[in-house]
């Protein structure tokens, strides 16, 4: 028998520095977690103790903090090289700055293979990107070889900016021939490493003949066997065992997100490459694990540029940006409108001639807007200003919801109106009218939504049974501020870009902004 240790991360999202327990900015260092310096300490400890170790990343290193905003992926290549990752799969967020923003900083600089079997380049891009990412890679591990096949969410064109010269194929259809090729080359230990979410990971384990282990990402799934060490609630045991269609037991793993945990899976193979046993657990990277001094020093060196960036002007406002709780928790506020407009703008994807865009709606809890921005400072808007407005380090995500769920969300928005509570919704691509004289749960008297399958966008009444795409903060997607109906009833959830980054990019693009209060949210009394 031969034993392999798989160390894995996924959805790190720019958390190069240690973070607080909820993966936001580290405040009290003695209670902080994760970060590449701490990760390196643990990885090195395991490499010294065990003979056959692979360090893998299942995608979405890009996007999430000011590190990515400033360094645009160069930081990912640099620190992943320093940690000596063995392989990485492409995630949807790796395309956030377009194909060029992937090729130059990451693909050309990485000293490890970057993988995806279901992304096919065409046209002029095919020769430019050839060999920079691969469908599979065979790695020597000790005296054996291990094949790693990559995959990426086929929804990437709706979630990021891969352009028109990359085709995202069905994962299972694309993986099978690559695994078959590895088998013909006498590779009998094969890991599928990819970024399509836990449901697809399980399907790959079930359907792709010859895959021995699946290491996934995208859904931020936390798996754990025994008593979990922090706040995350396990979605199942680690590893999650899937019985394949040909009768094999295939371990499937994922390691939550944000570099908080290091996935740790031990696999025992027989001489023919069959999995005999698998066991492990994610390792919580808490403060009991010291940060590696040399990596930490490097982080501090790179950090200097971030501090300079946060005080530079992104653009100007010629109006007061009202982000006060007195406005945003009670009525339409222009800061809410600005943020929602930025959220929609960030999700412009012309992937179908029938649709002007795939999504037109935004909702945003007023309690998430934490500060106004005064225009009387020469109109200057900086990253620092935006960090005061959006201090929680969240993301603006894409969900699919039924009209009936949206109706419940808007009822919840005003169910206890007047108490300055955070659940009051700011909107984009939505016209809502409330009648506060009616009883809670029956206060939405008009709800019109902007069409997407149209050449001239216009507002139509919400249909209860129709499925709509909506951009919203991850806080709401996870049921925050009492929006349990969103969490319980959402049909799909894809994590998006860092909130501040979305707004800062929009302001930089617009150069001068002047958001108004324009009647998106109205109040009425009497009959309708």
């Amino acid at each position: 028998a031969w034993e392999l240790t798989i160390l894995h991360t996924n959805d790190v999202h720019s958390r190069l520095e240690q973070t607080s327990e909820d993966s936001s900015k580290c405040v009290n260092a003695s209670r902080c977690m994760g970060g590449v310096a701490r990760l390196f300490t643990k990885v090195q400890q395991i490499r010294r103790a065990e003979p056959n170790v692979l360090l893998l990343d299942a995608g979405d290193q890009y996007q999430g903090t000011i590190w990515f905003t400033v360094y645009k992926g160069a930081e990912v290549a640099h620190f992943m090289n320093a940690l000596r990752y063995d392989a990485m799969a492409l995630g949807n967020h790796e395309f956030d700055n377009g194909v060029e923003g992937l090729i130059e900083p990451l693909l050309k600089e990485a000293k490890f293979p970057i993988l995806s079997a279901n992304i096919k380049a065409k046209g002029p891009l095919a020769s430019q990107i050839s060999g920079l990412y691969l469908p599979y890679k065979v790695l020597p591990v000790g005296d054996e070889v291990v094949g790693i096949v990559g995959y990426t969410s086929k929804e990437t064109p709706f979630l990021s900016n891969p352009g028109t010269n990359l085709v995202f194929e069905d994962e299972i259809t694309a993986l099978q021939p690559e695994v078959d090729k590895l088998k013909t080359l006498n590779v009998n230990k094969i890991i599928a490493l990819g970024h399509s979410g836990f449901e697809m990971d399980k399907l790959i384990a079930q359907k792709v003949r010859g895959v021995d282990v699946v290491v996934g990402g995208h859904s931020n799934t936390f798996l754990y066997t025994g008593n979990p060490p922090s706040k995350e609630v396990p979605a199942g045991k680690y590893p999650f065992i899937v019985t394949s269609d040909d009768g094999r037991k295939v371990p499937v793993v994922q390691a939550y997100a944000f570099g908080k945990y290091l996935g740790y899976l031990k696999i025992e193979f027989d001489e023919r490459g069959n999995v005999i046993s698998s066991h492990g657990n994610p390792i919580l990277l808490n403060s009991s694990i010291p940060e590696d001094p040399s990596i930490k020093a490097d982080i501090n060196k790179w950090r200097i540029k971030l501090d300079n960036y946060s005080t530079q002007e992104l653009g100007k406002t010629i109006v007061y940006l009202d982000g006060s709780s007195q406005s945003c928790r009670f009525r339409e506020c222009n800061m809410g409108n600005l943020i929602c407009d930025a959220m929609i703008n960030n999700n412009l994807r012309h992937t179908d001639e029938m649709f002007w865009n795939h999504v037109s709606m935004c909702i945003l809890n007023g309690g998430g807007i934490r500060s106004p921005i005064d225009e009387r400072n020469n109109g200057t808007i900086t990253w620092e200003n935006l960090a005061a407005v959006l201090p929680f380090g969240g993301t603006f995500d894409l969900v699919q919801l039924k009209g009936s769920t949206l109706k419940k969300a808007f009822e919840h928005s005003v169910h206890r109106y007047g108490q300055s509570t955070g659940e009051f919704l700011q909107v984009g691509g939505i016209h809502v009218v409330y009648d506060l004289s009616r009883k809670p749960g029956d206060r939405v008297v008009k709800l019109d939504v902007l069409c997407t399958k149209c050449r001239v966008p216009s507002y139509d009444p919400l249909k209860m049974d129709e499925v709509y795409k909506v951009i919203l903060p991850n806080f709401l997607a996870n049921g925050g501020d009492g929006f349990q109906m969103i969490k319980d009833e959402l049909l799909r959830h894809d994590s998006g870009d860092q909130d501040i980054n979305v707004v800062s990019t929009y302001i930089s693009k617009m150069k001068v902004i002047y958001p108004a209060v324009e009647g998106r949210i109205k109040f009425s009394t009497g009959s309708h």
Epitope: K137, G142, D143, N186
Partner: antibody, heavy 119, light 107 residues
Framework: QVQLVESGGGVAQPGRSLSLSCAAS????????MHWVRQAPGKGLEWVAL????????YYADSVKGRFSISRDNSKNTLYLQMNSLRAEDTAVYYC????????????WGQGTLVTVSS | KIVMTQSPATLSLSPGERATLSCRAS??????LAWYQQKPGQAPRLLIY???NRATGIPARFSGSGSGTDFTLTISSLEPEDFAVYYC?????????FGPGTKVDIK
Amino acid sequence: QVQLVESGGGVAQPGRSLSLSCAASGFTFSDYGMHWVRQAPGKGLEWVALIWYDGSFEYYADSVKGRFSISRDNSKNTLYLQMNSLRAEDTAVYYCVRDGQWGSRLDYWGQGTLVTVSS
Amino acid sequence: KIVMTQSPATLSLSPGERATLSCRASQSVSRYLAWYQQKPGQAPRLLIYDASNRATGIPARFSGSGSGTDFTLTISSLEPEDFAVYYCQQRSNWIFTFGPGTKVDIK
């Protein structure tokens, strides 16, 4: 059928350099690791170097480490051996060899090219 | 570094006889052992890999056995074309070493 044809052998002075090439045909070159193995006149076989199918990993015998460099061009189906700081003991027939299965079998051998290091 | 030894250095036999060649490694090489045949003026030819698997086109009279440190190549009945030098070869951590060879000549 698999064919491996070495070239570039000849006489070189000690301390000088020589470059060997191996043209491969009859198989998908980019799928296979490749080796150089040498045999001094009247002696046994000595492994020299291995390069991974895509050129990403290289391994060398201690006797040549730091002096010899193995490389490949998959677009040209060609394997190379750059030999620097040559010594008399590098005199040998150099064989280009296909790795048939991840180091467990060296399954196809070229006919070899003779390198003579002499002043 | 793993050192390979082969015995005997020379084996003198007649056609039709059984030949047993031995190869010993200075430390365990698991199953990563191969046997090659070389005739004068020719390149070596793969006979056996992974200690006991016959390469494509190799006659059934050639067989390999052993594991760990001790390995054997057996030629059940020598044919005239089998008189040659036989080398064993191991791989450990992607470093390869050959034994010094056993010469099988006609008695």
